[in-house]
């Protein structure tokens, strides 16, 4: 902490300007009024202060606002934001999307830092839900943001916000997250026609149940293997060879390339070899002709 010393004569800052970069740390502490700094925060960003000088400026703001900075100051923090700790940020009440954008801009191009994560958490909690504009902003800065949320947090996303989600935003989502997002997407896109609906819902299908996949198979959607491979295994298993053929359309040939990978492998094991042979792909591993299939899970449930 900087020791309290009197400001030398003639050095009292009348405004925040470039002359301050020549001030020693103790001079900044003694000669810059915290209230003046707070009202002229927007100028700080344009001045090439050293990290040590920024520490002093932060210290002055901390003294002025021990309960947390007001939004008028937060919005203009600029690079001073990088000096904030998650503990500092937890004291803030950020409600303006413009403030959020301004601070995310400072961290742009970098991984999500603990400070940014805390800021986003405070902002979203303050709003009560992840609305479309917020989601738009967050995924623009961090495409993986949505998949960093827990299923519980995702449950607060309203279906209307799903329109802001791009396919790449879901790349790292796991099945548990897609289980939450899929019903919301289904609701959001329910009024679209067949082909348009499929284009929009495609990225979310990792959360789709069997009955929805069966319904899609009746709509000539031609699902590609990249999408098929991301489906829930338990949703794929009950599909018949005919349903998978309809679901994939011309892409059905791709099953051969994935015959050892889930969910294709597990699905093949459930099909009659005769039925697989009708595809003409050379798929192996189906149930031989004449074998009886027992559903042991049902038997266990009964016993």
């Amino acid at each position: 902490e900087v020791e309290k010393t009197a400001c030398p004569s003639g050095k009292k800052a009348r405004e925040i300007d470039e002359s301050l970069i020549f001030y020693k740390k103790w001079e900044l502490e003694a000669c810059v009024d915290a209230a003046l700094l707070a009202t002229q925060m927007d100028r700080v960003n344009a001045i090439p202060f050293t990290y040590e000088q920024l520490d002093v400026l932060k210290h002055k703001l901390d003294e002025l606002y021990p309960q947390g900075y007001p939004e008028s100051v937060i919005q203009h923090l600029g690079y001073l934001f990088l000096k904030m700790s998650p503990e500092d940020i937890r004291k803030w009440n950020v409600t303006s999307l413009e403030t959020l954008k301004a601070l995310l801009e400072v961290n742009k191009g970098h991984e999500m830092s603990p400070q940014v994560a805390t800021l986003i958490d405070r902002f979203v909690k303050g709003r009560g839900q992840l609305d479309k504009d917020t989601l738009d902003t967050l995924t623009a800065f961090y495409p993986g943001y949505l998949c960093s949320l827990s299923p519980e947090e995702l449950s607060s996303v309203p279906p209307s916000s799903i329109w802001a989600v791009r396919p790449q935003d879901l790349d790292t989502c796991d099945p548990r997250q897609l289980d939450v997002l899929y019903p919301k997407a289904r609701l959001a896109f329910q009024n679209m026609n067949g082909s348009e609906y499929f284009v929009k819902i495609q990225s979310f299908l990792g959360g789709a149940p069997t009955e929805d996949l069966k319904a899609l198979s009746q709509q000539n959607v031609s699902m590609d293997l990249a999408t098929f491979m991301k489906l829930r295994t338990d949703a794929v298993l009950p599909l018949t060879v005919a349903e998978v053929q309809k679901l994939l359309g011309p892409h059905v040939e791709g099953l051969k390339a994935e015959e050892r990978h889930r969910p294709v492998r597990d699905w093949i094991l459930r099909q009659r070899q005769d039925d697989l042979d009708t595809l003409g792909l050379g798929l192996q591993g189906g149930i031989p002709n004449g074998y009886l299939v027992l559903d042991l899970s049902m038997q266990e449930a009964l016993s």
Epitope: D224, L225, A226, K230, H251
Partner: antibody
């Protein structure tokens, strides 16, 4: 521009292990399997196995079971191959290659990592 | 496993000459699962022909592929200097995927 970037040459002692990374850029990582291929002294190619980035499930050529372990880290779009209990027989160039889900053939290859096992 | 045997192992051809490389499989393949790769010294292999007869993007039209069952071939209708390379056939009809031993094509 699709790229698979592999690490530089490795010189390791017999009995040791090595982990070779393959970082992907320019495509949606989860839309492609990553396959690994061995080429000994400029001769033929041997398929080691492949890994699916969605399930992290790997399939191996039986010859390389217990020798190679294939994994992926989707957050960094990187596939890895670990080779263990190395002997001089493992001296080779190792390539990673991408294969679009549902398609055969490798449409893009890494530059190869030369592994030399020697004491 | 399916063994792929390529012949000849090495060959040289004059510019303008027709070149045919063969690839025999130890058991019958579905032809769409037979591919060819080109590799030049110090470089990675490149996908050259897929599904027996389809040229990969950027491959000159003087190349062609054909075959079925256990017998496949790659043909260069008129050899050029840039075609000097090794060519490997590859099958993914059954596990494990396998490659042929390669044919090295040199220019005279």
């Amino acid at each position: 521009d699709v790229q698979l970037q592999q690490s530089g040459p490795e010189l390791v002692e017999p009995g040791a292990s090595v982990r070779i990374p393959c970082k992907a850029a320019g495509h949606t990582f989860t839309d492609y399997n990553v396959d690994w291929v061995k080429q000994s002294h400029g001769q033929s190619l041997e398929w080691i196995g492949d890994v699916n980035p969605n399930t992290d499930g790997a399939i191996y050529n039986q010859k390389f079971e217990g020798k190679a372990t294939l994994t992926v880290d989707t957050s960094s779009s990187t596939a890895y191959m670990e080779l263990r209990s190395l002997t001089s027989e493992d001296t080779a160039v190792y390539f990673c290659a991408r294969r679009r889900l549902g398609q055969g053939g490798f449409d893009s290859w890494g530059q190869g990592t030369t592994l030399t096992v020697s004491s | 496993q399916v063994v792929l045997t390529q012949s000849p192992a090495i060959m040289s051809a004059s510019p303008g000459e027709k070149v045919t490389l063969t690839c025999g499989a130890s058991s019958s393949l579905i032809s769409k699962y037979l591919y060819w790769y080109q590799q030049k010294p110090g470089s990675s292999p490149k996908l050259w022909i897929y599904s027996t007869s389809n040229l990969a993007s950027g491959v000159p039209a003087r190349f062609s592929g054909s075959g079925s069952g256990t017998s496949y071939s790659l043909t260069i209708s008129s050899m050029e200097a840039e075609d000097a390379a090794s060519y490997f056939c590859h099958q993914w009809s059954s596990y494990p995927y396998t490659f042929g031993g390669g044919t090295k094509v040199e220019i005279k």
